[in-house]
């Protein structure tokens, strides 16, 4: 999906008042300087290709984050201010089903939901340039 | 404008199953979580789950998993709710809601006007 | 699972009274994710307050939210007939989930 038409200040806000509340709370009792931020993004559409991936597609170690809030309201907010976005999510989350089980919060899911944050982060200052 | 409209009351037996249907109008279905949640008679709110009909994602509280089966017909744009292995205590009224963001909240928006069904011998 | 504990239950208030209903939490839930409904009989839950305190459309500023953490409050600064109704917390932090068990407001 081409993340180009998203509107990025609706998203932006809806970030800012609820998903990052989200993923602080998964990552409640981690040292914010526990892992190190090795995704990286260069401009909104890139952020949230990146967020997506990182939210949606299972990585060894860590299957489950897609039955998280924070990636509910994530997938929501892609949906409704993304045009088109969710023609595109046709059965996409089916073939995952019975891998993803809630609540099996590993050390791999706490640094993926960490870089999650980063990208969201950077996804808030488009203008700032690439370190 | 957005609207949800619920079949009509059912009155069934214990044991066996009722599919309650939530039509949505005035908005992209697919693009919006659909949640179900009931209300038995004279008692609060319990939430039983929600369907992303864009992908058929499904979230179900416990204790409805197994028992309650959420779907979408994006051609119709129509949610449905199925609950199986009725008993008495599954009377109540059950009610569909979008989930949306609202002032950048995130929560239910428009709800239908409810489906009351009847479990009983 | 995350609960939620109205209090009162059952509230009796006259007409122009300051009316208070809180909810109480079991764990600590960020303010953006409590809301508040209205219920009339018969009817289904309409949003009432989002985030806390967020008024939804229609509400009339009379109606307040505040808190945080693990207790939240729903403020009536002057009751009035047509607020007569069962007012449900609910959570939004963690599933599944959740609402309080309801607050019935009447009118004296």
């Known amino acids: 999906y081409d993340f180009t038409n998203c509107d990025f200040e609706k998203i932006k806000a809806a970030y800012l008042s609820t998903i990052s509340k989200d993923l602080i709370t998964y990552m409640s009792g981690t040292k914010s300087t526990e892992f190190n931020n090795t995704v990286s993004c260069s401009n909104r559409p890139h952020c949230l290709t990146e967020i997506q991936s990182l939210t949606f597609n299972p990585t060894a170690g860590c299957a489950s984050l897609a039955k998280e809030m924070f990636a509910m309201k994530t997938k929501a907010a892609l949906a409704i201010w993304c045009p088109g976005y969710s023609e595109t999510q046709i059965n996409a989350t089916q073939a995952m089903k019975k891998r993803r089980k809630r609540k099996v919060t590993t050390n791999k899911c706490l640094e993926q939901v960490s870089q999650l944050q980063g990208l969201w982060r950077r996804f808030n200052r488009p203008l700032l340039k690439q370190q | 404008q957005v609207q949800l409209v619920q079949s009509g009351a059912e009155v069934k037996k214990p044991g066996s199953s009722v599919k309650v249907s939530c039509k949505a109008s005035?908005?992209?279905?697919?693009?919006?979580?659909v949640n179900w949640v009931r209300q038995a008679p004279g008692q609060g709110l319990e939430w039983i789950g929600q369907?992303?009909?864009?992908?058929?994602?499904?979230d179900y509280a416990q204790k409805f998993q197994g028992r309650a089966t959420l779907t979408a017909d994006k051609s119709t744009s129509t949610a449905y709710m199925e609950l199986s292995s009725l008993r008495s205590e599954d009377t109540a009224v059950y009610f569909c809601?979008?989930?949306?963001?609202?002032?950048?909240?995130?929560?239910?928006?428009?709800w239908g006007q409810g489906t009351t069904v009847t479990v009983s011998s | 699972d995350i609960q939620l504990t109205q209090s009162p239950s059952f509230l009796s208030a006259s007409v122009g009274d300051r009316v208070t209903i809180t909810c109480s939490v079991s764990?600590?839930?960020?303010?953006?994710?409590l809301h508040w409904y209205q219920q009339k009989p018969g009817k289904a839950p309409k949003p009432w307050i989002y985030?806390?305190?967020n008024l939804a459309s229609g509400v009339p500023s009379r109606f307040s939210g505040s808190g945080s953490g693990t207790e939240y409050t729903l403020t009536i600064s002057s009751l009035q007939p047509e607020d007569a109704a069962t007012y449900y917390c609910?959570?939004?932090?963690?599933?599944?989930?959740?609402f309080g068990q309801g607050t019935k407001l009447e009118i004296k």
């Open positions: 369907i992303y009909p864009g992908d058929g994602d499904t």
């Open positions: 005035g908005y992209t279905f697919s693009s919006y979580w």
């Open positions: 985030g806390t305190s």
């Open positions: 764990s600590s839930i960020s303010s953006s994710n």
């Open positions: 609910q959570q939004w932090s963690s599933y599944p989930l959740t």
């Open positions: 809601a979008r989930g949306t963001y609202y002032n950048n909240y995130y929560g239910t928006d428009y």
